[in-house]
Every structure is written in structure tokens, then in C-alpha cells.
């Protein structure tokens, strides 16, 4: 199905406009901002979601140490250029002709330049590390219960194939979820780890992208998991290119 037929809405993306004008009167949904048709049986790409967001009215287990090449999205929101398939274009520019290169999750991976800046290809983010700090609880969560529930969440809510959830680490109060997905591993129809991570990030912040859902209620053996802080690290198949000036 492409959208909920009964009242013509998009279950997986509330930032859409839907109408029964598809083939045979079927419900068809288009993303705000771009007007692109979206498949409501799966997650919408992060690029289209960011574009829609910008168009909306402004109202003994060890934890993983992110590699030196890990990127954090420090630039915040911007109005991205998306390709016809909804992916980020490799080069992004703002209205003042400042340009930069991004990876497949839309995070800047070069210094900013002018219109002459070249971004030869869209570099894939193949490893995402989601670092969460949960609110103190009476006791630590059971690691295997936590692991199972987070894997179930990514499988059922975000429709991410289980093989792409590489690991769940836990050292109270820090939880780390590792998502890995190389270009060669991603088959047609597979949810992208970048899109799943973005939906999760918005859910955790109480800004669910799903239609008609108030927010994420994640429980481990009945105890709500309340996240106080989220950091997401992105690792690209090709290391980013920043000048030494930025690294000091």
C-alpha cells in the first residue's frame, strides 16, 4: 500500500499532503517542501524530511570510542537540495552562495567554500553510532532486555533489517546503538541506516514523524527509557576532508 486508504494519510510521514488522485483513485502523498511523491509503506528519506521541516511554518562491555573521522552534525538545520530519488545532492549551497560537500545523511564533510567547490560523489555514511544517556533509574536496565527491545524497535518501527543493527552497548547510564550498512550490503527496498537514525532521533526528542503518533514510549520490562541526551556520530566510507585549521 502507498498510503492509508481509509482517510488518505501517510502513516510513516506526517509532513505530507495526501489526496486520492493516484492511479485508480488511490491515495497519493507528496512531501511538503519538495512536492515529491513518497512511499508511505516505508520511511521517507532524511533529505525530503529536512526539506519539509524547513518549509513548515516556524512555530565489561566497553562503549565505543568514535573514530577520529567521526562526524557530528554541528551545523543544525538547513534547506537541502535533494536528487530525484530523495537523496542528498553531494554539494549543498545556501542562499549566499556558500557551498559544502555532504555525506549520505546530509552532514557536512568538507570546509565551506564558494560556488567553485566540487563534490565529485555522494559519500556513503556506512557506520552510525547513536550515543544516548538515560535518566537515572532505580537500577541498571538488564543489558539483554535492552538489546532485544532496541533491536525490535529498529526492526518493527523503523523497518530496518536486523543485520544492520551491529551492536547495542550499555554502561549505565550510557547506551550506544551501532548501525552499519555498506553500499554493497544495501539491497533495493532496504531502509537506509541514515533514515532510520533520523526517525529515531526525532522520536527520542518527542517530535515523532509518524502520522498520528504522540511520541515514542520505549519500555524495557515495563520501565520507560527516558533519554536525557543524544549524540550521533557518522562515519563515512571515505574520511572527511577538513583543513587542519578546523581540527585545532
Amino acid at each position: 500500500h502507498t498510503a492509508a486508504q481509509d482517510n488518505c494519510t501517510c502513516p510513516t510521514n506526517k509532513m505530507t499532503v495526501c489526496s486520492p488522485d493516484g492511479p485508480g483513485g488511490r491515495c497519493q502523498c507528496r512531501a511538503l517542501g519538495s512536492g515529491m511523491a513518497v512511499d508511505c509503506s516505508t520511511l521517507t528519506s532524511k533529505c525530503l524530511l529536512l526539506k519539509a521541516r524547513m518549509s513548515a511554518p516556524k512555530n565489561a562491555r566497553t562503549l565505543v570510542r568514535p573514530s577520529e573521522h567521526a562526524l557530528v552534525d554541528n551545523d543544525g538545520l538547513y534547506d537541502p537540495d535533494c536528487d530525484p530519488e530523495g537523496r542528498f545532492k553531494a554539494r549543498q549551497c545556501n542562499q549566499t552562495s556558500v557551498c559544502w560537500c555532504v555525506n549520505s545523511v546530509g552532514v557536512r564533510r568538507t570546509d565551506k567554500g564558494d560556488l567553485s567547490l566540487r563534490c565529485d560523489e555522494l559519500v556513503r555514511t556506512h557506520h552510525i553510532l547513536i550515543d544516548l544517556r538515560h535518566r537515572p533509574t532505580a537500577g541498571a536496565f538488564n543489558h539483554s532486555d535492552l538489546d532485544a527491545e532496541l533491536r525490535r524497535l529498529f526492526r518493527e518501527r523503523y523497518r530496518l533489517h536486523p543485520k544492520f543493527v551491529a551492536a547495542v552497548h550499555y554502561e549505565q547510564p550510557t547506551i550506544q546503538i551501532e548501525l552499519r550498512q555498506n553500499t554493497s550490503q544495501k539491497a533495493a527496498g532496504d531502509v537506509d541506516i541514515g533514515d532510520a537514525a533520523y526517525y529515531f532521533e526525532r522520536d527520542i526528542k518527542g517530535e515523532s514523524l509518524f502520522q498520528g503518533r504522540g511520541g515514542l514510549d520505549l519500555r524495557v520490562r515495563g520501565e520507560p527509557l527516558q533519554v536525557e541526551r543524544t549524540l550521533i556520530y557518522y562515519l563515512d566510507e571515505i574520511p572527511p576532508k577538513f583543513s587542519m585549521k578546523r581540527l585545532t
Partner: antibody, heavy 119, light 112 residues
Amino acid sequence: QVQLQESGPGLVKPSETLSLTCTVSGFSLTSYGVNWIRQPPGKGLEWIGVMWAGGSTNYNSALMSRLSISKDNSKSQVFLKMNSLQTDDTGMYYCARDENWDGAWFAYWGQGTLVTVSS
Amino acid sequence: DIVMTQSPSSLAVSLGERATMSCKSSQSLLNSGTRKNYLAWYQQKPGQPPKLLISWASSRESGVPDRFSGSGSGTDFTLTISSVQAEDLAVYYCKQSYNLFTFGGGTKVEIK
């Protein structure tokens, strides 16, 4: 469509064990939790316990020592066992679906089954 | 355990009048991360199972008339029926899901 149906004996003798079954359709027990709630005649609602989708359970602390909840995913059934029944256990027993990650709200309920504890 | 206290226990209102009922919890129901409250309101009519009206303290369920509204945060919550209709005759329960589940004692809405 989502449906829940409670079943079990209407009459139970004091000190005996109550066994109820909640049979569900329209969803999988591996994706949604099922709660048991009861209501004495003319009184309010009391949460009994829950069988989560992942297979773990939680119980009302006041009733925990007498309770056991289990399930059979393949048969789409959740079972409630409560022992050492007394007359004040009389009431309507409901099962209700938890809304998974959208919130622990009970959006779908069975019609309930009346349990009378009497000798 | 979290204790939920509802008041009044019964409320007699004329048709078209506003009805307001209160629910207080013994501890905060606010998730500081998502800024959402783990509180729901249910309506139970005679001889029927309860029906979910409001989730997350203020989110009206689909199909619920807009005369019903929920408000409040932390420990104090309110359910308001802006203009009571005959079909609103029922008992209204609040329920916390911050620490497992507890229902309030209920508020019975009667027609004057």
C-alpha cells in the same frame, strides 16, 4: 480488525484458582503487549498485570504473589492465572492491548468476562 | 507505587454546560527528554469497557469529539468537556503509565 476476547469460568469457589484466556486477532502478540484489568461491581478500574510483546511480564504489586501471566504467540492467546481467590476478587475482568511504542495506552479492549467468587 | 487521585468523585452538570475534572498524581509523570506526560483519560459508559479519549495528557484520540480536551503537566491534570452532551454520561478515569499503570478512582458525570 483488532479484537480481544476474554473467556473463562463465570463462577469460582473461594480459595480456588482463576484461569482466564484472552484470544486476540488482527495483530500479533510478538508486536503488542496485552494487559489485564479488573473492575469490582460498581467500583473503579484496577490494573492487574501485563504480558509485553518481548515475553516479559509486570504485575500489580498488591496482587503479585497470586498472579501468573503467560502467552502462546502461535495461538494468539494470553493467559491469566490468579490463585487463592476471595469474594472481593469478584468483578469484570478485561484484557486490553498496549499501543507498543506509541504509548502504554489501552486503545483496544475486550468486552470483559464476569467472574463471581462464591461458594 | 504512584497514587492517582481524582476529584470530584461525581459531577452533575446541565446539558451544554462545561464540565471540569481533576487528576493528581503522587509524583511527576513528565518525561524530561520528550517533554511529554505519561497520562491518559478513559471514558466508561454503563455496561461497556472503557474507551481511550486522551493520551500523552493532551492528545485527543482520533474520532473523539473536540469538546473533550486534556491539559496539565507534572502532577496536576484536567479533563474538560466544553459543552456536555447527553451521550457524555459516563465515568471518566485517568491513568498513569510512568511507572507501570495505575488508574484514578474515577469521576462520574451525571446530567442535572
